[in-house]
């Protein structure tokens, strides 16, 4: 039975041109995480696996920084960024917990984070 | 390019304990970074995931096979081996070493890329 | 754990022909699906994985489509080597599971 549940940054913002940290945490689980999944809609961005460390997708290798923790950092923020993001914490032996969190990146600098959300 | 050789007895007596060893060659597995994997196929049947190690020790296991199956890892060998104990004439197949996720550094992926030829196991009498 | 679907078990082809293999997971996998070719006495060998992306030295004529629980492997143009079994695995929580398989045939 899965009982975690995954709390995520929920709807943030950030300004064209700067960096956001996209961060997950599971909890109410005892189960392991073997690995995180980050995913923008059907794109992979990164892995971290718990054994082989971190793998950055080639096409993102320019923009995307592991961390800090099992987190993401984006960097050189485009208009073309804003929209969801996915980590998919792969847990043994529980299965799969995904989280969603929505970013905007504005023009403006006026970018202020949204609430804290949880996704069963 | 890594290579895999299984080793161990091809028959084994009801009740007993199945012991593989899989021998790497080509690169040291202290350094390695992907699983080391045992995966059988029972006569005219489909593959099963027994369990994969990872050097640091760090081991998974096929559920239904759980309270039967242990893998370890000798790094000062370059080998890994597989323990099945209990066996029946269920347990009779061919066992196969593999590595996964050789690739993953540059690629992101896991997947079973690199196969030993593998070696059959008569559980019998 | 996820459950692994393959069908059909056999698919009788002519070489030449175009060979469609479907493989069904009994929850979303994402893209981490393999699929594999093994010949009798040989041990499996890696086609693709990503669902999509052929592995080092597989020819064109293999190629690999879906995504979450339903794929699908296409062999494009059959030729006397492919006839073999082919399985699908998923790659994304352990326990890592394998479909049951799909035996192309000469026709």
């Known amino acids: 039975m899965m009982t975690g549940t995954i709390e995520t940054t929920g709807n943030i913002s950030a300004e064209k041109g700067g960096s956001i940290i996209l961060q997950c945490h599971l909890s109410s689980t005892t189960a392991q995480v073997t690995q995180v999944n980050w995913e923008q809609q059907d794109q992979l961005l990164a892995i971290c696996n718990a054994d082989l460390g971190w793998h950055i997708s080639p096409s993102f290798k320019d923009r995307v920084a592991p961390g800090p923790g099992l987190g993401l950092t984006l960097q050189s923020l485009t208009v073309n960024d804003t929209g969801e993001y996915f980590c998919i914490y792969h847990t043994y032996p529980d299965g799969t917990y995904t989280g969603r969190i929505f970013l905007e990146v504005l023009e403006s600098s006026v970018a202020e984070h949204g609430a804290r959300f949880q996704i069963p | 390019q890594l290579q895999l050789q299984e080793s161990g007895p091809g028959l084994v007596k009801p009740s007993e304990t199945l012991s593989l060893t899989c021998t790497v060659s080509?690169?040291?597995?202290?350094?390695?970074?992907?699983?080391l994997a045992w995966i059988r196929q029972p006569p005219g049947k489909g593959l099963e995931w027994i369990g994969s190690?990872?050097?640091?020790?760090?081991?998974y296991y096929n559920p239904s096979l759980e309270s039967r199956v242990t893998i370890s890892v000798d790094t000062s060998k370059n080998q890994f081996s597989l323990k099945l104990s209990s066996v029946t004439a269920a347990d009779t197949a061919v066992y196969y070493c593999?590595?996964?996720?050789?690739?993953?550094?540059?690629?992101?992926?896991?997947?079973?890329?690199?196969w030993g030829q593998g070696t059959t196991v008569t559980v019998s009498s | 754990e996820i459950v692994m679907t393959q069908s059909p078990a056999t698919l009788s082809v002519s070489p030449g022909e175009r060979a469609t293999l479907s493989c069904r997971a009994s929850k979303s996998v994402s893209s981490n699906l393999a699929w594999y070719q093994q010949k009798p006495g040989q041990a499996p060998r890696l086609l693709i994985y990503?669902?999509?992306t052929r592995a080092t030295g597989i020819p064109a004529r293999f190629s690999g489509s879906g995504s979450g629980t339903e794929f699908t492997l296409t062999i494009s143009s059959l030729q006397s080597e492919d006839f073999a079994v082919y399985y699908c695995q998923q790659t994304s929580p352990w326990p890592r599971t394998f479909g049951g398989g799909t035996k192309v045939e000469i026709k």
């Open positions: 990503f669902a999509s």
């Open positions: 080509g690169g040291s597995i202290s350094s390695g970074s992907y699983y």
């Open positions: 190690i990872f050097r640091s020790g760090s081991t």
């Open positions: 593999a590595i996964e996720g050789a690739n993953f550094k540059d690629f992101g992926y896991v997947a079973f890329d690199i």
